[in-house]
Amino acid sequence: LPAQVAFTPYAPEPGSTCRLREYYDQTAQMCCSKCSPGQHAKVFCTKTSDTVCDSCEDSTYTQLWNWVPECLSCGSRCSSDQVETQACTREQNRICTCRPGWYCALSKQEGCRLCAPLRKCRPGFGVARPGTETSDVVCKPCAPGTFSNTTSSTDICRPHQICNVVAIPGNASMDAVCTSTSPTRSMAPGAVHLPQPVSTRSQHTQPTPEPSTAPSTSFLLPMGPSPPAEGSTGD
């Protein structure tokens, strides 16, 4: 004969545990029903009556099957440097993530506690490590034959254009300027003598907490807080 299915509340067999979505109530010494996500235990079970569940109130939630007397409070509203990627509902907490152009300098269990603006590389420096959701941009000096003339959290150093006749040679922060003949972005092999790369580094500058004006993309979603790199700047 099949074993009879026990209905909650019931006393468990010695040495056995309660079933899935049930909990053992120490006071009643019975297996009782848990409340579903979005609910909490309004009245605990007794030897003769099961748990009474009730819906979570506004701005509170429970994410798991539970027997908590009160639902958890949703986190505070997202700050201005964040976007709400998951709303507060009866079954889930609000999740705030950093908006484009910012990264998470201090994370919490879900979402981000503190966002910081992505470092911007100043002219003469380019992005050597793009930012992600959780790591800042790394800037490095432009190598000989390349330049960056922008203050940007996304721009890498680019090769100088190649002129038939050079009006102004390029440097780390400026492209070459050609005379009226049309430029290309190529060079004949061995046609250029690259100078030694710069070995000086510029002063550290702290990024300012203004939002980034550099073009942001879905890729700007980067490791943790780091001191500003040389060659970085704020607006």
């Epitope: 050597a128 490590r129 490095k140 790369p197």
Partner: antibody, heavy 118, light 109 residues
């Protein structure tokens, strides 16, 4: 001129570790990432990782996260790659390089042959 | 880890045009993958040809060009020369690491 000079060939037993060095000259080592790439016999390139000599920060390919350690000594302008728990599949030529898909500062060491054999 | 796939081998006639491609297992290649192309000739040092998807590195002839084509990174060689016979590797950036493709052996015949 810019040069990256690597240490000599190594023969190791499975399970052992190897440490390859790469001495750079002609530029400030702090200005560019140093990459490590390997090429097994008759195979393509495999990126191991890169280290920022300025602060020691490293980024590894997922396959090397647990076995590779990249370090630099800025006082001697030398980068190091240590690979542990060697197996026969690690037999390859290991290159250090300033090649970085972000910089166009494109110099490579001469390569260090590591042979793993019992 | 992402897998980057290239044609194992291609052949082009001298003076002809050929396009090498680079596919990502994670979806379309975008500018955020900063596609790079590296050339390896037998017995010679590696040489970066293209960076940032479409920028020729200093010293690279104009016959080499980089682009995105149908969700893949592409290297087009227009007016192939005998000296262009080599192995070509693409490299794609994935958030915090580079992945090289298996390489394309280009024969100029």
């Amino acid at each position: 001129q810019v040069q990256l000079v690597q240490s000599g060939a190594e023969v190791k037993k499975p399970g052992a570790s190897v440490k390859v060095s790469c001495k750079v000259s002609g530029f400030n080592i702090k200005d560019f990432y140093i990459h490590w790439v390997r090429q097994a016999p008759g195979q393509g390139l495999e990126w191991i990782g890169r280290v920022d000599p300025e602060d020691g920060n490293t980024e590894y390919a997922p396959n090397f996260q647990d076995r590779a350690t990249m370090t630099t000594d800025t006082s001697t302008s030398t980068a190091y790659l240590e690979l542990s728990s060697l197996r026969s599949e690690d037999t390859a030529v290991y290159y250090c390089s300033t090649w970085d898909g972000f910089s166009y500062f494109d110099y490579w060491g001469q390569g260090t042959t590591v042979t793993v054999s019992s | 880890q992402a897998v980057v796939t290239q044609e194992p081998s291609l052949t082009v006639s001298p003076g002809g045009t050929v396009t090498l491609t680079c596919r990502s297992s994670t979806g379309p290649v975008t500018t955020n993958n900063y596609a790079n192309w590296v050339q390896q000739k037998p017995g010679q040092a590696f040489r970066g040809l293209i960076g940032g998807t479409n920028d020729r590195a200093p010293g690279v002839p104009a016959r080499f060009s980089g682009s995105l084509l149908g969700g893949k990174a592409a290297l087009t060689l227009s007016g192939a020369q005998p000296e262009d016979e080599a192995e070509y590797y693409c490299a794609l950036w994935y958030r915090n690491h580079w992945v090289f493709g298996g390489g394309t052996k280009l024969t100029v015949l």
